[in-house]
């Protein structure tokens, strides 16, 4: 049976004066020689050599200063061996407890704690939680930390409360005002032994976050400006406001608006984000003849909503702005600034000369009537197609057009007309748009396979030829309607997509015949005028060769049928 004792040892001091700090004996010692052996941490495992045993007596001595924070207790395995070196007892685990001393100060997890809280926050609002640890024995006074605020900057009324035990930093009042102090620096101490022992300090930097608790206020009670009529202005006037909230934030940024007077939408107010000034802009020209002065009322708020602590106190306060409109001799102008004319359908592009489009007169802006004492001239006139009468402002074509003209864009030609005030020399410009129809000047042509046919079998192949590939086959061939009183002499029969057979339906006398042919493409595009085909019908010999020509005057040129003109 083991007989044992072990004294606790205090860390950080020389316990050897109290040796033996433990003793082990086996009751077998009474009858035989026993050798004692110990092992474990502090003996034959690191930290080595703290405890030694007297092999003969079982006295255990401590030889070194111990650190409870490194080893809170030592478990010593004890053995009793007989003369043969065999165990006479079951190994014994002896515990040597190390008593704590207050040799460790509190340690803050950060040297500087950062926190933030909105101004006007309710009292007792949590700002941050400080964290500190103490390496001394847990749940003992040596490691029980008490926190306190040592100092506050800016000094004055204490604004924060620090929980002694939890390290919570809370607001002491609801009167935090960023506009008075935008940040606070607290020096905090943490002391163990519940505030009576070793202490350490840390710093808390608390940012007071801005809320929109200040209204923007105009620096002046009223504003005025003058502007000439008919002009725009990117900066007619600047309004200064004062807002105590944090600069360049939405709580500070001003939003200007009209409360009255801008019903005509002549003005806009833009905020200069650098200075927070309101810039009054004229975005729609004013007319002195209609309005000699404008009485505006303006107000200001912030981009951000007002904070709930002040929103009930907000009233829209209108500030008067008077704008004096200055009369300007206005002169002449085209009203509207552009005019569109349309060329009547069916007009040939070759018959445009002297075609009158209409008139486009300038008006006197002071009277709103047609301007007198003006001279009209063409301005930009690409292709030189148009001309304007210098007195009447009548516009007409002076040149025919090619339907492929590069000046026709989207079936429109564009030109400018100028009205010159003969008194002041001032010029006003109007834009003329002329919508032109499709001129089918390049429609397909019909080509006869041969110029002459025998009167005995008067037939010939007609082929369609396109010049610019604008027309796409297949083509429909038709003869132009003849006067009802005349019987039909010629007929036409389609052979394929681009050709047809023209033949006389009865025997006809020799002569030169003019036949009118209408060609239509697959998109139903047709020539403006029918194509006129000239065909000679002659008396042929038995080899099918034309005989002696007939006199050209008699029987004369024939149109479809001898002796008949159209």
């Amino acid at each position: 049976e083991w007989v044992k004792f072990a004294k606790p040892c205090r860390e950080g001091e020389d316990n050897s004066k109290r040796n033996p700090i433990a003793k082990i004996t086996s009751d077998y010692q009474a009858t035989q020689k026993i050798t004692y052996r110990i092992s474990g941490v502090g003996i034959d495992q690191p930290p080595f050599g703290i405890f030694v045993v007297d092999k003969n007596t079982g006295d255990i001595n401590i030889t070194a200063i111990v650190d409870r924070e490194e080893t809170p207790s030592f478990l010593i395995t004890c053995r009793a061996l007989n003369a043969q070196g065999l165990d006479v007892e079951k190994p014994l685990i002896l515990t040597v407890k190390i008593l704590d001393i207050n040799d460790n100060p509190p340690v803050f997890s950060q040297q500087i704690f950062m926190g933030e809280i909105e101004e006007n926050s309710a009292s007792n609002s949590l700002v941050m939680i400080l964290n500190a640890t103490d390496a001394d024995e847990p749940n003992h006074l040596n490691s029980k930390i008490a926190f306190k605020i040592v100092s506050q900057e800016p000094a004055g009324t204490p604004m924060f409360l620090l929980s002694r035990n939890t390290g919570e930093v809370r607001t002491l009042t609801n009167s935090l005002d960023r506009e008075q102090a935008s940040s606070y620096r607290l020096v905090v101490s943490g002391a163990d032994k519940d505030g009576e022992g070793l202490s350490t300090q840390c710093e808390c930097n608390i940012k007071v976050k801005d809320v929109n608790d200040n209204f923007p206020m105009f620096r002046d009670s009223q504003y005025s400006a003058r502007i000439e009529e008919n002009i725009l202005s990117s900066e007619l006037l600047r309004f200064q406001v004062t807002d105590l909230d944090e600069e360049y934030t939405d709580n500070w940024l001003a939003v200007y608006f009209f409360t009255s007077g801008n019903e005509g939408n002549w003005f806009e107010i833009q905020t200069d984000p650098r200075t927070n000034e309101g810039i009054l802009k004229v975005v729609k020209a004013l007319d002195y003849e209609q309005l000699q002065s404008v009485k505006l009322s303006i107000a200001v708020k912030n981009k951000a909503e007002f904070h709930q602590s002040v929103i009930s106190r907000y009233r829209v306060q209108s500030t008067p702005v008077t704008i004096q409109v200055i009369n300007v001799r206005e002169g002449i102008a085209f009203r509207p600034a552009s005019k569109t004319f349309t060329v009547q359908k069916g007009i040939s592009s070759k018959k445009l000369v002297d075609y009158i489009l209409g008139t486009y007169q300038a008006i006197d802006e002071d009277t709103n009537k047609a301007a007198s004492n003006v001279k009209y001239v063409m301005g930009r006139n690409d292709g030189g197609y148009l001309m304007i009468d210098s007195k009447t402002a009548e516009i007409k074509f002076v040149k025919n057009m090619n339907r492929d003209s590069t000046f026709i864009v989207n079936k429109t030609i564009t030109a400018e007309v100028l009205a010159i005030d003969e008194y002041t020399g001032k010029t006003s410009t109007g834009t003329v748009y002329v919508r032109v129809p499709d001129f089918n000047d390049n429609c397909p042509t019909a080509v006869l396979e041969k110029d002459a046919v025998c009167s005995s079998s008067p037939s010939v192949v007609v082929s369609a030829r396109t010049l610019n590939n604008r027309y796409t086959g297949p083509y429909t061939f038709a003869l132009e309607d003849q006067p009802v009183k005349l019987p039909a002499v010629w007929s036409i029969t389609t052979l394929n997509a681009t050709s047809a057979l023209l033949r006389a339906q009865e025997q006809i006398p020799p002569g030169v015949y003019h036949i009118s042919l209408v060609l239509t493409d697959s998109q139903n595009n047709r020539c403006e005028m029918p194509r006129s085909l000239t065909l000679e019908v002659c008396q042929c010999d038995n080899r099918g060769i034309c005989g002696t020509s007939y006199p050209t005057t008699s029987p004369g040129t024939r149109y479809g049928r001898p002796h008949s003109g159209r």
Epitope: R37, S39, I43, Q45, P47, F48, L81, G85, D87, P91
Partner: antibody, heavy 121, light 112 residues
Framework: QVQLVQSGADVKKPGASVKVSCTAS????????LHWVRQAPGQGLEWMGV????????SYAQKFQGRLTMTRDTSTSTFYMELSSLRSEDTAVYYC??????????????WGQGTLVTVSS | DIVMTQTPLSSPVTLGQPASISCRSS???????????LSWLQQRPGQPPRLLIY???NRFSGVPDRFSGSGAGTDFTLKISRVEAEDVGVYYC?????????FGQGTKLEIK
């Protein structure tokens, strides 16, 4: 591969001190205990002591108590053995040896090449 | 201190023949953790010691399998099944159960 490289041979006068170094390669410096063993000319091996590289604690054989100091420098992975008050019977080859087990540290598996220290007047 | 006693102190052996070295401790070498910290080391002439066997019977890496260890408590044996020329040297037993660690006085193995 573990390697222990010791400082070169040294000659000392009686009463002087000698400091032998042992540099360990590999990245397990703080894991394994380091022992010092000496061998007098023509004699057997004699264990001198052990050092824990992690905490620096030591255990010395009773014979060397008071004269022997073992230290280590973790930044250079080097161990030092200093023996003071030298006498002629301290003339020997001094070996450093590292354990192969990290926990008990009781098996001397890796040995330095040895440093001959001669104590002579 | 635990005293380690080796026998024989010298052992002349014929190449290819077996050899055996004994080691006895003054106390049991069984540690309280249950392990027996007895090692065998070989020291060839002019070289540092080399670990052969640890914890009675465990061969260290790179050691030929002709070396084997046995024993318990206080009596231990190192056997070489077939001696080779390179085996010449001094063999030591080492107890590491208790501080201070102690070596046997060594057994010199030589070829006949």
């Amino acid at each position: 591969q573990v390697q222990l490289v010791q400082s070169g041979a040294d000659v000392k006068k009686p009463g002087a001190s000698v400091k032998v170094s042992c540099t360990a390669s590999g990245n397990t410096f703080t894991t394994y205990s380091l022992h010092w063993v000496r061998q007098a000319p023509g004699q057997g091996l004699e264990w001198m002591g052990v050092i824990d590289p992690s905490g620096g604690s030591t255990s010395y054989a009773q014979k060397f108590q008071g004269r022997l100091t073992m230290t280590r420098d973790t930044s250079t992975s080097t161990f030092y053995m200093e023996l003071s008050s030298l006498r002629s019977e301290d003339t020997a080859v001094y070996y450093c040896a590292r354990s192969i087990e990290s926990i008990s540290g009781r098996t001397l598996g890796y040995w330095g090449q040895g440093t001959l220290v001669t104590v002579s007047s | 201190d635990i005293v380690m006693t080796q026998t024989p102190l010298s052992s002349p052996v014929t190449l290819g023949q077996p050899a055996s070295i004994s080691c006895r401790s003054s106390e049991t070498l069984v540690h309280s953790d249950g392990n027996t910290y007895l090692s065998w080391l070989q020291q060839r002439p002019g070289q540092p010691p080399r670990l052969l066997i640890y914890k009675i019977s465990n061969r260290f890496s790179g050691v030929p399998d002709r070396f084997s260890g046995s024993g318990a408590g206080t009596d231990f044996t190192l056997k070489i099944s077939r001696v080779e020329a390179e085996d010449v040297g001094v063999y030591y037993c080492l107890q590491a159960t208790e501080f201070p660690y102690t070596f046997g006085q060594g057994t010199k193995l030589e070829i006949k």
